[in-house]
């Protein structure tokens, strides 16, 4: 069964800066990745970035830099101030559309006890949905 993992980290240097890393653990070919916050994409969440393996990357504030880390994992740096700033309990979700498995989505947030600059290891996140 495919899995999606999500890792959220607050940067030590800037407390309003977050890094989200997501990966797809499956054998299929990824056709699109959507990163959202505030909940799953299409279920109250707001899209931060869309990454297509061949068409490129689109992102919207407070996303600052989205990129492919490998063929099956991505990272996104968020920088916020004021209303658009993420907070420690913000939920971030990553949805991977792949062939032939379909769409798989997982969500995660900053570990409650994490110090700036630290993060939980990238394990499959608890919220997992297949379309």
């Amino acid at each position: 069964t495919p899995e999606v993992w999500v890792q959220v980290r607050m940067e030590a240097t800037e407390l309003s800066s977050f890094t989200i890393r997501c990966g797809f653990l499956g054998s299929g070919s990824i056709s699109l990745v959507t990163v959202s916050w505030g909940g799953p994409n299409g279920a109250g969440g707001t899209t931060l970035a869309v990454l297509h393996p061949e068409r490129g990357i689109r992102q919207w504030a407070p996303a600052r830099q989205a990129r492919w880390e490998t063929q099956s994992s991505i990272s996104l740096i968020l920088e916020g101030s004021g209303a658009s700033s993420p907070c420690a309990n913000t939920t971030f979700c990553c949805k991977f559309a792949s062939f032939p498995e379909g769409s798989w989505e997982a969500c995660g947030s900053l570990p409650p006890s994490s110090d700036p600059g630290l993060s939980a290891p990238p394990t499959p996140a608890p919220i997992l949905r297949a379309d």
Partner: antibody
């Protein structure tokens, strides 16, 4: 099928503003971002910016930051681009294009003339 | 900004012959993480909006005839029409799909010789 509808032409006076529309149909409007592109004869295509209707948040080409304002009305599935302080160099054909530029509107010709 | 430069500016080719358009970017369009080139090609016929032909430097959009092909990597790319047809007369643009702002080449006008 996915369609983007734009009015054919706008004739405006120098120094005024114009608000161009792009009505989307055939898909969920909030799940597909809208780009705006300028075409002037002999000058090629220029990307003005994009906006994601789900978050109302735009990105701008720095060159157009003080010229264009991108907005959306999700209730009518329409994207708008307002152009201000119009001058002769703003006379052009303006296209809206969906997502990764795979669907285009027919374009609106803006003519700035007194 | 990434500057896209096409050559030639205009091109006249006989029907059935090969047409080649080059595009050079001022920065690499290769994504190091997934080794994909983010470059697209568009065709614009008179009185029509641009039409996506090729993305990812070499992937044909659905419905595009196989006489159109794209190649290249990094900063140098090529659009090839293997056997020119009358309906291919148009202006062709390359586009940086890699990073904001999404810049286009100046266009290459393709005509029948």
């Amino acid at each position: 099928q996915v369609q983007l509808q734009q009015p054919g032409a706008e004739l405006v006076k120098p120094g005024t503003s114009v608000k161009l529309s792009c009505k989307a149909s055939g898909y969920t409007f909030t799940s597909y971002w809208i780009n705006w592109v300028k075409l002037r004869p002999g000058q090629g295509l220029e990307w003005i910016g994009d906006i994601y209707p789900g978050s109302y948040i735009p990105n701008y080409n720095e060159k157009f930051k003080n010229k264009a304002t991108l907005t959306v009305d999700t209730s009518s599935s329409t994207a708008y681009m307002q152009l201000t302080s119009l001058a002769s160099e703003d006379s052009a054909l303006y296209y809206c294009a969906g997502g990764y530029f795979d669907v285009w509107g027919a374009g609106t010709t803006v003519t700035v003339s007194s | 900004d990434i500057v896209m430069t096409q050559s030639p500016d205009s091109l006249a080719v006989s029907l059935g012959e090969r047409a080649t358009i080059n595009c050079k970017s001022s920065q690499s369009l290769l994504s190091s993480g997934n080794q994909k080139n983010y470059l697209a090609w568009y065709q614009q016929k008179p009185g029509q909006p641009p039409k996506l032909l090729i993305y990812g430097a070499s992937t044909r959009e659905s419905g595009v005839p196989d006489r159109f092909s794209g190649s290249g990597s990094g900063t140098d790319f090529t659009l090839t029409i293997s056997s020119l047809q009358a309906e291919d007369v148009a202006v062709y643009y390359c586009q940086n799909d890699h990073s904001y702002p999404y810049t286009f080449g100046q266009g290459t006008k393709l005509e029948i010789k």
